[in-house]
């Protein structure tokens, strides 16, 4: 009778086990084992009993222990079984961002893991179970299908074997996937509203805010703002569930013409778009053309008006005839046009806006000097000791320079508060002297003395 | 640090008993798997395994002299002894104990520093 | 009983490689061991489980066992390598030594 021992084992993969065969007489004629494994035999006291350790167990195996004894020959058999957790166990990729409402399918895969009747499949988010299955099928795969919500965000799904061989007096082995971290997003249907201005000029700036409500998670969302090939640098303020960026924006004489201004927002693998038109255009203020800024009196001037091509212009007023971009006027100078305002207005219509712009030359004319009996009157009578102020203003531009002398020498102290005396008395010379020439104009000063009262 | 040292008479007469001890220390024969042999080496010649036991008192000896020898141990006083009867002066050899620390492999990784019996008249 | 048969000498040149086998039927179904012995020296294990080195050996040593043969390997021999060596199996319940070997290094 061959017996051996243990009769079944359960060891790791590419383990060693010993196993001892016996047999019921004391000299047999042979005593041994039939296995495909590595086997050594170990010293041992006695004939009826040989130990083999049996090495690098890969496989569930059923090594024959056999004797022979004068009473015939026997064999025993011992069953291996082979233990070992799954080689390969991941959960299908899937994309990080999820939208709040989508059914997502979560799918695990495992490769290996013996024995399988001991091995079971847990689908889990975080530590709660979602599905249990046992291992079936190489690779053995397991599903679950997931309703997305927004308190889903960032749990972290995960695959995990149980190999339990505690029912052999052994522990429970468990393997765990990478985890899969959802980020679950809500980007409404409704584009974000740009708020810009619909036309800009060249070298100017402009403000533009893109903006959108009912996101989820609203940190999350990024924000690309251009302006044609302009990418801008927002400045982005978050709400609760809303974000409002704002970018400050400049433009060149080469951005010329109808820009895309574009917003979109990305959340999640998901995007929204706005598309607004803005139209840049250059709009240089309009050219005011004196023949002359400065002319002499009684000269003839031309005052010309020339704005943007496609603009309409008024001169002082006067829209061009015919209406369009330049306007002209001709005037004789007078000394009251000195200091006179020429006022162009150009209008030019950009994407249906009416844009103004407005230029101002002053005409200065040349003229004088002059003298004349309203602001230099020629005959003055004051009381002597009295208190008076010489006046004589001479008219001209540029402003004349004014002296009033008597005899060549004695000055009349014109503008100035002077005590009348005898040495007042007398004709005076008055002369008015500036670039445009000189005039005179005699002035006598009477002196009444108190004895003639 | 594992000591073996042998002690017993170094000149026996033919026909008579040889009784060896093997005094070991570092170790001790109730630890599971442990083991104390002898081997002996006559002058000029190859090593000649003798005898063993083990930590579960099962003893082995050499099929040539099974009927001469007795293995036995103390494993309080952490002693081995060897008797060989019927000594001849062929039995001249230095005796040597060993230790197998695992018996069911064999070897023998601490030797003692043997004892040079001469069986003479 | 099994009988284990190692040849009386092998010569080795400095530096060169000895190998010492040792042949015994199913020799590679136990276990085999090694054991240097320097005169007047009580043995040293050097190789034990066909091909475990114990601490304190030098790597050049090493062992292998398959089939008849079990072989002792020295790497790079040394002066100091000349000894005798012996391999030792088992037949149950008997334990076995081979004739030993007379490692002789040249020069």
């Known amino acids: 009778q061959t017996s051996v021992s243990p009769s079944k084992v359960i060891l790791p993969r590419g383990g060693s086990v010993l196993v001892t065969c016996s047999t019921s007489c004391d000299q047999p004629k042979l005593l041994g084992i039939e296995t495909p494994l590595p086997k050594k035999e170990l010293l041992l006291p006695g004939n009826n009993r040989k130990v083999y350790e049996l090495s690098n167990v890969q496989e569930d195996s059923q090594p024959m222990c056999y004797s022979n004894c004068p009473d015939g020959q026997s064999t025993a058999k011992t069953f291996l079984t082979v233990y070992w957790t799954p080689e390969r166990v991941e959960l299908a990729p899937l994309p990080s961002w999820q939208p709040v409402g989508k059914n997502l399918t979560l799918r695990c895969q495992v490769e290996g893991g013996a024995p399988r009747a001991n091995l079971t499949v847990v689908l889990l988010r975080g530590e709660k179970e979602l599905k249990r299955e046992p291992a079936v099928g190489e690779p053995a795969e397991v599903t679950t299908t997931v309703l997305v919500r927004r308190d889903h965000h960032g749990a972290n799904f995960s695959c995990r074997t149980e190999l339990d061989l505690r029912p052999q007096g052994l522990e429970l082995f468990e393997n765990t996937s990478a985890p899969y971290q959802l980020q679950t997003f809500v980007l409404p249907a409704t584009p974000p509203q740009l708020v810009s201005p619909r036309v800009l000029e060249v070298d100017t700036q402009g403000t533009v805010v893109c903006s959108l409500d009912g996101l989820f998670p609203v940190s999350e969302a990024q924000v690309h703002l251009a302006l044609g090939d302009q990418r801008l640098n927002p400045t982005v303020t978050y709400g609760n569930d809303s974000f409002s960026a704002k970018a400050s924006v400049s433009v060149t004489a080469e951005d010329e013409g109808t820009q895309r201004l574009t917003c979109a927002v990305i959340l999640g693998n998901q995007s929204q778009e706005t598309l607004q038109t803005v139209t840049i255009y250059s709009f240089p203020a309009p050219n005011v053309i004196l023949t002359k800024p400065e002319v002499s009196e009684g000269t003839e001037v031309t005052v010309k008006c020339e704005a943007h091509p496609r603009a309409k212009v008024t001169l002082n007023g006067v829209p061009a005839q015919p209406l369009g971009p330049r306007a002209q006027l001709l005037l004789k100078a007078t000394p009251e046009d000195n200091g006179r305002s020429f006022s162009c207005s150009a209008t030019l219509e950009v994407a249906g806006q009416l844009i103004h712009k407005n230029q101002t030359r002053e005409l200065r004319v040349l003229y004088g000097p002059r003298l004349d009996e309203r602001d230099c009157p020629g005959n003055w009578t004051w009381p002597e000791n009295s208190q008076q102020t010489p006046m004589c203003q001479a008219w001209g531009n540029p402003l004349p320079e004014l002296k009033c002398l008597k005899d060549g020498t004695f000055p009349l102290p014109i503008g100035e508060s002077v005590t009348v005396t005898r040495d007042l008395e007398g004709t005076y010379l008055c002369r008015a002297r500036s670039t445009q020439g000189e005039v005179t104009r005699e002035v006598t000063v009477n002196v009444l003395s108190p004895r003639y009262e | 640090q594992v000591q073996l040292k042998e002690s017993g008479p170094a000149l026996v007469k033919p026909t008579q008993t040889l009784t060896l001890t093997c005094t070991f220390s570092?170790?001790?024969?109730?630890?599971?798997?442990?083991?104390v042999g002898w081997i002996r080496q006559p002058p000029g010649k190859a090593l000649e395994w003798l005898a063993l036991?083990?930590?579960?008192?099962?003893?082995y000896y050499s099929t040539s002299l099974k009927t001469r020898l007795t293995i036995s141990k103390d494993t309080s006083k952490n002693q081995v002894v060897l008797t060989m009867t019927n000594m001849d002066p062929v039995d001249t050899a230095t005796y040597y104990c060993?230790?197998?620390?695992?018996?069911?492999?064999?070897?023998?990784?601490?030797w003692g520093q043997g004892t040079l019996v001469t069986v003479s008249s | 009983d099994i009988e284990l048969t190692q040849p009386p000498s092998v010569s080795v040149a400095p530096g060169q490689t000895a190998r010492i086998s040792c042949s015994g039927d199913?020799?590679?179904?136990?276990?085999a061991s090694w054991y240097q012995q320097k005169p007047g020296q009580a043995p040293v294990l050097v190789i034990y489980?066909?091909?475990d080195r114990p601490s304190g050996i030098p790597e050049r040593f090493s062992g292998s066992n398959s089939g008849n043969t079990a072989t002792l390997t020295i790497s790079g021999t040394q002066a100091e390598d000349e000894a005798d060596y012996y391999c030792?199996?088992?037949?149950?319940?008997?334990?076995?030594f081979g004739g030993g070997t007379k490692l002789t290094v040249l020069g």
């Open positions: 060993a230790r197998y620390p695992v018996t069911q492999r064999s070897y023998m990784d601490v």
């Open positions: 570092g170790f001790s024969l109730s630890t599971s798997g442990v083991g």
């Open positions: 036991i083990d930590w579960d008192d099962d003893k």
């Open positions: 199913a020799l590679g179904d136990k276990y």
């Open positions: 489980d066909d091909s």
């Open positions: 030792q199996s088992y037949d149950s319940p008997q334990v076995v």
